[in-house]
């Protein structure tokens, strides 16, 4: 069998500064089993070096001097007895760039440098960024372990130093932020903020960093109801809104949360399984009615919990007046006025612009009031005949406005002219 020296190794390898690379390698050399068995030594040298005098970059021979600059960084990996010459290069440095050759020695007969199969190593600038690992999603209030590691880095060379920065870390002990791992308990306000891990090799100028934007899952903490872009005040999960009857109303409910809560509106104070009247945060009423006094509830449903706010509508209205209308009856002139308002209005009668209070002591007039449904009625009875043309007025008012109506009673005429005079405050 013809003696053969063969080396299988890639021609060139590129590694980023500060990272590691494993260069697979296998070799063969002529050896007869009946030979004696001196130890097998293998070496990696810088190209151009003379094997007999030069310091090696890596070897399995404990008696050979290793270059101080590659000590602990260039290592033989694998079993040389099984003809494995794989080379591990750690914490690569720019000055490592160059060619390397492999040499085998065994006893007096085997001494061979594989000059035809050189390994060309190129160290480039570090562009690799570290990876920040954590279990997603981050949940508000739940402690989560984060770790920072650089793909392609290894234990070789001086230790790595870490530093963490970000708003979410403000309460942490500075020492904690120098480890490759940290425990974070995120808050809702940390959502969308940046967290940066920076890595540096001690004694080297090589630094790299990665920034991630935190996606913190949190349930709604507050609900805000807006009317015309203005937030309503909320006390004990209830908001009070005075609104004019007949007015159109558009309300927007907002509950910051992540992921966004499902917003819906309900009539009154709903059961958990109630049907919404809007499946969004928008509630539109074409017209507020007195029936709306029951109010509405905005509910924010979220995987981490739900929140709801009751909107108590206080419906008010300007007085609406029907009348007065007058007719002659046995006991005298009978005038009626109907009015409707929220809150209930006050009403007064006037005769020739003079107020008629209660019932007259002389019995010349009598006032009666009653209510039925949303309407209240008041009647005025004037005893005796008319001496001249008379103007009878009734006026209703509440804190929001007033309305008055009058009738002109013409002496000797059966038809009575009426007129309504609205007056808003």
């Amino acid at each position: 069998e013809k003696p053969v020296y063969e080396l299988q190794v890639q021609k060139s390898v590129t590694v980023q500064e500060g990272l590691c690379v494993l260069v697979p390698c296998s070799f063969s050399y002529p050896w007869r089993s009946w030979y004696s068995s001196p130890p097998l030594y293998v070496y990696w040298f810088r190209d151009g070096e003379i094997p007999y005098y030069a310091e090696v970059v890596a070897t399995n021979n404990p008696d050979r001097r290793v270059k101080p600059e590659t000590q602990g960084r260039f290592r033989l990996l694998g079993d040389v007895q099984k003809k494995n010459c794989s080379l591990s290069i750690g914490d690569a440095r720019m000055e490592d760039t160059g060619s390397y050759f492999f040499r085998v020695e065994r006893g007096r007969d085997v001494k061979y440098s594989y000059q035809q199969n050189k390994l060309n190593l190129e160290v480039t600038a570090l562009i690799e960024k570290p990876d920040i690992h954590f279990l997603e999603p981050l949940e508000s209030g739940r402690p989560t372990r984060l770790s920072c590691s650089l793909p392609g880095s290894c234990e070789a060379g001086p230790p790595l130093t870490f530093s963490w920065t970000g708003n979410a870390l403000s309460p942490l002990d500075p020492e904690t932020t120098r480890s490759s791992e940290l425990t974070l308990t995120p808050r809702p306000e940390d959502h969308g903020t940046n967290l940066t891990c920076q890595m540096k090799r001690q004694g080297a100028q090589v630094t790299t960093e990665r920034t991630v934007q935190l996606n913190v899952s949190y349930a709604p903490q507050t609900i805000t109801i807006f009317r015309n872009g203005i937030a309503l005040e909320i006390l004990q999960n209830t908001s009070y809104l005075p609104v004019l009857e007949g007015q159109a109303l558009r309300l927007l409910c907002d509950a910051p949360s992540n992921p966004p809560a499902h917003l819906s509106w309900f009539q009154g104070s709903p059961a958990l399984n109630a049907t919404p009247i809007s499946n969004t945060g928008i509630l539109e009423l074409r017209r507020v009615r007195s029936a709306e006094e029951g109010g509405f509830t905005c509910r924010a449903q979220h995987p981490l919990g739900f929140l709801q706010i009751f909107l108590n509508l206080s419906v008010y209205s300007l007085p609406q007046l029907l009348g007065p209308s007058c007719s002659w009856e046995a006991e005298g002139l009978h005038c009626r006025c109907s009015f409707r308002a929220r809150p209930a209005p006050s009403l007064c009668w006037r005769l020739e612009e003079k107020p008629l209070e209660g019932n007259s002591s002389q019995g010349s007039f009598k006032v009666n009031s009653s209510s039925a449904g949303p309407w209240a009625n008041s009647s005025l009875i004037l005893h005796g005949g008319l001496s001249s043309d008379l103007k009878v007025s009734c006026k209703a008012w509440n804190i929001y406005g007033s309305q008055s109506g009058s009738v002109l009673l013409l002496q000797g005429r059966s038809n009575l002219g009426t007129g309504v005079v609205p007056a808003a405050l």
Epitope: I277, I282, R286
Partner: antibody, heavy 122, light 113 residues
Framework: QAYLQQSGPELVKPGASVKVSCKAS????????MYWVKQSHGKSLEWIGY????????RYNQKFKGKATLTVDKSSSTAFMHLNSLTSEDSAVYYC???????????????WGQGTLVTVSA | DIQMTQTPSSLAVSVGEKVTLSCKSS????????????LAWYQQKPGQSPKLLIY???TRESGVPDRFAGSGSGTDFTLTISSVKAEDLAVYYC?????????FGSGTELEIK
């Protein structure tokens, strides 16, 4: 509970007109729109229009413009539909129906009157 | 105008059977502001006024038995009667109230075998 009571059947001659009434009870008439629907014999339903009882505003299906006029009398809580220039095509059952919640001008018909049969025949 | 198409026009079923009635609209009935489908289902028994069963495509009107269920969104809607009873003999109409003029389907007549 809302209840709508419609006027009785009408037999009218072609060219004449008819006024169908719908009295509302159990709720405030002005709080809800009142819809009117036509159902010809053995046929589906057709929306005629609605009246906003609060302000008297109306909206009609183009097909019934000029044929139907909707009005309301708040004092008696009654809605009316006046049909004019009647032909045999107008023979049908006419329903009044109240909307559901009264929040939107586009709502379902929650309560129906019993229907008024109008027969147009010479 | 929005066209409402109901299928089948009639069907005969036995008591206890499950029934599915279909209604398709010529355009989407989903209102973006409140994410509700503006569709209603009515039941009209012989000689009676229509009665509301379902509104907003899936909300059962109070007092309607829970064997009636509405589903669907956009343009395709379904009324399901989980176990038909003899009293369910009627014509069932779907109606859109998304845009004027409001329109009804031509109805599905449910007969009991």
């Amino acid at each position: 509970q809302a209840y709508l009571q419609q006027s009785g059947p009408e037999l009218v001659k072609p060219g004449a007109s008819v006024k169908v009434s719908c009295k509302a009870s159990g709720y405030s008439l002005t709080d809800y729109n009142m819809y009117w629907v036509k159902q010809s014999h053995g046929k589906s339903l057709e929306w005629i229009g609605y009246i906003d009882s609060y302000n008297g505003g109306t909206r009609y299906n183009q097909k019934f413009k000029g044929k139907a006029t909707l009005t309301v009398d708040k004092s008696s809580s009654t809605a009316f539909m006046h049909l004019n220039s009647l032909t045999s095509e107008d023979s049908a059952v006419y329903y009044c129906a109240r909307e559901g919640f009264g929040y939107d001008d586009r709502e379902w018909f929650a309560y129906w009157g019993q229907g008024t049969l109008v027969t147009v025949s010479a | 105008d929005i066209q409402m198409t109901q299928t089948p026009s009639s069907l005969a079923v036995s008591v206890g059977e499950k029934v599915t009635l279909s209604c398709k609209s010529s355009q989407s009935l989903l209102y973006s502001t409140n994410q509700m489908n503006f569709l209603a289902w009515y039941q009209q028994k012989p000689g009676q006024s229509p009665k509301l069963l379902i509104y907003w495509a899936s909300t059962r009107e109070s007092g309607v038995p829970d064997r009636f269920a509405g589903s669907g969104s956009g343009t395709d809607f379904t009324l399901t009667i989980s176990s038909v009873k003899a009293e369910d003999l009627a014509v069932y109409y779907c109606q859109q109230f998304y845009s004027y003029p409001f329109t009804f389907g031509s109805g599905t007549e449910l007969e009991i075998k």
